[in-house]
């Protein structure tokens, strides 16, 4: 067969769906590969093809088109399961093309199988709440163009395995369920279960997504520096092991970068000669404010490392702040026999 | 100094209705959820109503739900609780009192008075 | 909605000695539990919130513990001014709650 410009399998778009619910996969070439929509296609005399493979199977098959009640159909770029089933699991492809041009792109579908309880191996959507916002709205996503709009669907909320009822702060609005002044408790996997009536039968959508209330913003601060600070003198003898913590609390800013490095005469540590380590951790509170600690290490310390400027630096969204460490050469103490002896005279 | 000093505490019929007032001062009130807590004569701490920092969050006990209406004016540094169809039960010192998720009500004013009788 | 239970309701001791006050929730509250002190005329000021930080000021002779559902307040030497109704509350789940209180009185 002719030449086909094949964009491989896109496994950037793992899509997931429930077993036994309706379906609708739009063909990701004009999302994502190609510069044009399926109508400027469709009126150019492209044809587009889908076809599939069968989990494990090697074999590419047409998708039959004539199951009964239409179970697997085709509306301009989307691909339609009313519903679906565990074995349309595969890798699908769509295809689109005319005697000249040729573009193809396939994706993997997996058919997931949920409990009573909502439980699954989906992976969920994270939506993040403002902890002691006033009024905050999660919405059920991914259930555009399944209805007209004109059909008016039922829908209900739970949280977890329980239906959202009598919830003081939790209050389902349609689409949307609305969280009063979130708290940590409010953290949890959220289900909308949206039914619609079509052609005489009755279809049910399962969107579960998960909760995380995370610091708010009203509440944040520029990064705050625990360590190095005034209280503490890193006192040390030449061939020594120095160790210098720098330890930085970032409150929870969404979408900041945080970061913390040191720099030892006002240079970064992987622009001066000297054999320095630096080990870094990151711990989370509940709302998702952040502490580094990044120890800087010297094996075995010279005094003139020991007269260095060691300055621990943090950044995020919020502000830039610095502190030097206080690091300095312990005097030894006077050894009586050598020392004193010779303040006394003796020879 | 952190202060909140309520006001319009009363002696009200049952069926009337009272506007407390709470003035805070000392601190940033716009950042501040903040709350009312009451204790009837020799009974314990009961929480009535609360509201977001920036006033679209409330949230009621079941006892006043539909009766009492928590507002907030942070212009004026000053909460409110409009408190109508008072009942007996109603009777009770009101507290208002700032509240952090992480350290509870944190700061509390001295109190207001309401008394429902006949 | 979560039910705060205080024990004693009464605690009786002498100046100087150890007062342990219990609370109990009826479902975990992790460690969101806060413990207030109340006198006569007076109204509630924070002891401890997060089940065991002492708030501002308060002194170290105040301490609390737990977490989930059982909960204890502890006054290691208790000095005339410690005489008072102290009351458990969580904050948790709206709504937050309070326990019925414990007085601690003069033995």
């Known amino acids: 067969s002719e030449r086909c410009d094949d964009w491989g399998l896109d496994t950037m778009r793992q899509i997931q769906v429930f077993e036994d619910e309706p379906a609708r996969i739009k063909c990701p070439l004009f999302e994502h590969f190609l510069k044009f929509n399926y109508s400027t296609a469709h009126s150019a005399g492209l044809t587009l093809i889908w076809y599939w493979t069968r989990q494990d199977r090697d074999l590419e098959e047409p998708i039959n088109f004539r199951l009964p009640e239409n179970r697997i159909s085709k509306e301009k770029d989307v691909l339609w399961f009313r519903p679906t089933l565990l074995n349309d699991t595969g890798n699908y492809t769509c295809m689109l093309r005319n005697t000249t041009y040729c573009s193809k792109v396939a994706f993997p579908l997996e058919v997931v199988q949920k409990d009573s309880c909502f439980n699954s191996p989906m992976k969920l959507p994270v939506h993040k709440l403002y902890i002691e916002y006033g009024i905050q709205r999660i919405t059920c996503p991914n259930v555009d163009g399944y209805f007209p709009s004109s059909v008016k669907p039922t829908i209900t909320w739970y949280m977890g395995c329980y239906k959202i009822q009598n919830f003081n702060n939790v209050i389902p609005e349609g689409m949307n369920l609305s969280f009063l002044i979130a708290l940590i408790s409010n953290n949890g996997n959220y289900t909308c279960v949206v039914t619609y009536p079509e052609n005489g039968r009755t279809f049910h959508l399962t969107r579960t997504l998960t909760v995380k209330v995370v610091g708010s913003p009203k509440n944040a601060v520029p990064p705050v520096i625990h360590s190095p600070n005034d209280h503490v003198v890193y006192e040390k003898e030449p061939g020594e092991e120095l160790l210098i913590p720098c330890t930085v609390y970032f409150s929870f800013l969404m979408d900041s970068r945080n970061e913390v490095w040191w720099t030892i005469d006002g240079k970064k540590p992987d622009d001066i000669t000297i054999d320095v380590t630096i080990n870094e951790s990151i711990s989370h509170s509940r709302t998702e404010d952040e502490t580094r600690t990044q120890i800087l290490s010297i094996k075995k310390v010279t005094s003139e490392d020991l007269k260095r400027s060691y300055v621990c630096h943090a950044r995020s969204a919020k502000g830039e702040v610095a502190k030097a460490a206080k690091v300095k050469q312990k005097v030894p103490a006077p050894r009586y026999t050598v020392e004193l002896a010779c303040g006394f005279g003796a020879t | 100094e952190v202060q909140l000093l309520e006001s319009g505490g009363g002696l009200v019929q049952p069926g009337g209705s009272l506007r407390l007032s709470c003035a805070a001062s000392g601190f940033t009130f716009e950042h501040s959820s903040a709350g009312w807590v009451r204790q009837a004569p020799g009974k314990g701490l009961e929480w009535v109503s609360a509201?977001?920092?920036?006033?679209?969050?409330?949230l009621y006990a079941d006892s006043v739900k539909g009766r009492f209406t928590i507002s907030r004016d942070n212009s004026k540094n000053t909460l409110y609780l409009q408190m109508n169809s008072l009942r007996a039960e109603d009777t009770a010192v009101y507290y208002c009192?700032?509240?952090?998720?992480?350290?509870?009500?944190?700061?509390w004013g001295q109190g207001t008075l309401v008394t429902v009788s006949s | 909605e979560i039910v705060m239970t205080q024990s004693p309701a009464t605690l009786s001791v002498s100046p100087g000695e150890r007062a342990t006050l219990s609370c109990r929730a009826s479902q975990s509250v992790s460690s969101n539990l806060a413990w207030y002190q109340q006198k006569p005329g007076q109204a509630p000021r924070l002891l401890i919130y997060?089940?065991?930080t002492r708030a501002t000021g308060i002194p170290a002779r105040f301490s609390g513990s737990g977490s989930g559902t059982e909960f204890t307040l502890t006054i290691s030497s208790l000095q005339s001014e410690d005489f008072a109704v102290y009351y458990c509350q969580q904050y948790n789940n709206w709504p937050w709650t309070f326990g019925q209180g414990t007085k601690v009185e003069i033995k």
């Open positions: 997060g089940a065991s």
């Open positions: 509201i977001s920092y920036d006033g679209e969050g409330t």
């Open positions: 009192a700032r509240f952090r998720y992480y350290t509870a009500f944190d700061y």
